[in-house]
């Protein structure tokens, strides 16, 4: 399955000496049949490689069995003995190279692993004579040492040194988590993103950090506009406040009224919640009417009675809907100066006689005007 | 060469359950995401939901929220849509479809999809 | 969810044919908008990515503007292999939704 990798255990071998140029079993590389102890091996020196077998923690370590973390190996490195770059900026280029196929330096092994990176493992380094004519066996080992530890990932190298029975071996080795994987074990996944599925970067710890205007676990909840109010509205995209049904204003803090409500307004949507002193479903029945019209005259006392409707409590004398009509007018005999009484459906009226006018006759034509009256001099008056 | 290949279609009463899949090849399955993409007879295109295979998180379309569930099997490179409680209007040739992405686009876009398998929900 | 509202539904054309179809969001989606291009039977191919870059393979005949609400897909050149249906697709804000296609056919 391609599945791609959460880390990389990465070995960069530095030095290996095998001053005797000599397989582990005693017998020269070029397979004279002599061996050191007959004299040496100085014809043909080795064509030295590394295996490397990583896997699962051991604590006495055993060289066969699967290399349960991964595999690698170097292509031939040198002779008898050579010494390689130390790791470090050459190394890094390598890996990024390693991982889009590319050439990379000789000495270093690349294992990629899938799985949470235990922080416990055994390395098990081989360096081997490379036979054009033979596949590899025991018999072409020049050197096997093994490491069993624990290393977390970090771009820091760790230097091992192993003294083997015949070769010497300088080594360096590290974990790092690949691109979009973080954590001691590099098995948590973030990379970046700016779409439907979230809009955020990743931190040094592999948290989402949402990008402006985004929030939420996944970075998928817009921002809305500042002050609305997310009982009632709502956002899609940043910035935005677009009300529920039955909601309106800048802010979604405001319930639509009942439709056609004139004094009365709303604590829930489509209600109508009415003022005081109106009442009806539309708050458009004035419960006070006395208060807003005062329609009582003459001292007349004004009772709210159905809505839009009011009484008049009018005191002795007086009568009619806003006791406008005065009863029995002319018994106070109002009229001066001879004037008759005659009573109306407004009050009284007084018919004065020649010379006198007002409306209770009382206005002497002669002293106030320096005139004669015209006409009969008869006035009416509306009490 | 990139693949996606939809399996698990079929004849189903309303009310019944069936299983999609869609076997992925040819590139690092957990470095994209695979969504499911419907569309009915002669209709448009209707998104479905989506899964991020690297880390199980999916999303889903209203439609189907509570009936419809997507996985995935990042050790064999496959991408599953459970349905259930299907009703007629679930009738459609699904899609599976790979959608790629990088901050430094706004948006992203389907940029392979397998062949599609019909799903019939009729009694 | 944001609505995606594309014009004309159908449009007919003839070979050489500057044709151009446009896609209004219902709330802004800055750039997150990609085209598809769909025949009869098949699965759609992607053509335009992030409002305005060319897939890769897809001739440059095809190109997308736009953003905020407003986006164009235009094909400076129309060939036979063109004759199809056009869908636009929002990814900005989940769920991600299509416009409800435009079908380009032979004048």
């Known amino acids: 399955a391609d599945l791609g990798s959460m880390g990389y255990f990465e070995l960069q071998l530095s030095a290996l000496r095998n001053v005797n140029g000599e397989l582990l079993s005693g017998a020269c590389c070029d397979g004279d049949g002599r061996t050191t102890r007959a004299g040496g091996c100085g014809r043909d020196e080795c064509d030295t490689y590394v295996r490397v077998c990583l896997k699962e923690y051991q604590a006495k370590v055993t060289p066969t069995g699967p290399c349960s973390y991964g595999y690698g190996a170097t292509p031939v490195l040198g002779g008898n003995s050579f010494y390689l770059p130390p790791a470090g900026a050459a190394g890094d280029r390598a890996r990024a190279r390693s991982r889009t196929g590319g050439h990379q330096d000789p000495g270093l092994v690349v294992i990629p692993f899938q799985f949470a990176w235990p922080r416990s493992f055994t390395l098990i380094v081989e360096a081997w004579d490379w036979d054009n004519d033979t596949t590899p066996d025991e018999e072409l080992l020049i050197e096997r040492v093994s490491h069993a530890g624990m290393i977390n990932p970090e771009d820091r190298w760790k230097s091992l040194h192993f003294s083997g029975h015949v070769a010497h071996l300088e080594l360096q080795i590290r974990v790092r988590c690949d691109e979009n994987y973080y954590s001691a074990t590099c098995n948590k996944f973030c990379r970046p993103r700016n779409d439907f599925f979230g809009h955020y970067t990743c931190d040094q710890y592999g948290n989402k950090a949402c990008m402006d205007g985004w929030m939420g676990k996944e970075c998928k909840e817009a921002v809305c506009k500042q002050g609305c109010n997310l009982l009632h509205g709502g956002c899609t995209v940043p910035g935005e406040c677009r009300c529920s049904y039955g909601w309106q204003g800048k802010f979604c803090d405001e319930c639509v009224p009942y439709p056609g409500c004139v004094h009365g307004s709303c604590v829930e949507p489509w209600h109508c919640d009415c003022e005081t002193n109106w009442g009806g479903l539309l708050c458009d029945k004035d419960l006070n009417y006395c208060g807003s019209h005062h329609p009582c005259v003459n001292g007349g006392t004004c009772i709210n009675a159905e809505p839009d409707q009011y009484l008049c409590a009018c005191p002795d004398g007086y009568l009619g809907k806003n006791c406008e009509r005065a009863e029995h007018a002319c018994a106070s005999n109002p009229c001066a100066n001879g004037g008759s009484c005659h009573e109306v459906p407004s009050g009284f009226e007084c018919h004065c006689p020649s010379g006198w006018n007002g409306p209770t006759c009382a206005l002497d034509i002669d002293e106030e005007f320096g005139l004669v009256p015209r006409g009969s001099g008869h006035h009416h008056h509306h009490h | 060469e990139v693949q996606l290949v939809e399996s698990g279609g079929g004849l189903v009463q309303p009310g019944g359950s069936l299983r999609l899949s869609c076997a992925a090849s040819g590139f690092t399955f957990t470095s994209y995401d695979i969504h499911w993409v419907r569309q009915a007879p002669g209709k448009g295109l209707e998104w479905v939901g989506g899964i991020s295979p690297a880390d199980g998180d999916t999303d889903y379309a209203n439609s189907v929220k509570g009936r419809f569930t997507i996985s995935a099997d990042t050790s064999k490179n496959t991408a599953y849509l459970q349905m259930n409680s299907l009703r007629a209007e679930d009738t459609a040739v699904y899609y599976c479809?790979?959608?790629?992405?990088?901050?430094?686009?706004?948006?992203?876009?389907?940029?392979?999809w397998g062949q599609g398998t019909l799903v019939t929900v009729s009694s | 969810d944001i609505q995606m509202t594309q014009s004309p539904s159908s449009l007919s054309a003839s070979v050489g044919d500057r044709v151009t179809i446009t896609c209004r969001a219902s709330q802004d989606v800055s750039t997150a908008v990609a085209w598809y291009q769909q025949k009869p039977g098949k699965a759609p191919k992607l053509l335009i990515y992030?409002?305005?870059f060319l897939y890769s393979g897809v001739p440059s005949r095809f190109s997308g503007s736009g953003s905020g609400t407003d986006f164009t897909l235009t094909i400076s050149s129309l060939q036979p292999e063109d004759f199809a249906t056009y869908y636009c697709?929002?990814?900005?804000?989940?769920?991600?939704?299509f416009g409800q296609g435009t079908k380009v056919e032979i004048k």
């Open positions: 479809a790979r959608n790629d992405y990088d901050v430094r686009f706004v948006g992203s876009g389907m940029d392979y």
């Open positions: 697709q929002q990814s900005f804000t989940a769920p991600p939704t």
């Open positions: 992030s409002a305005s």
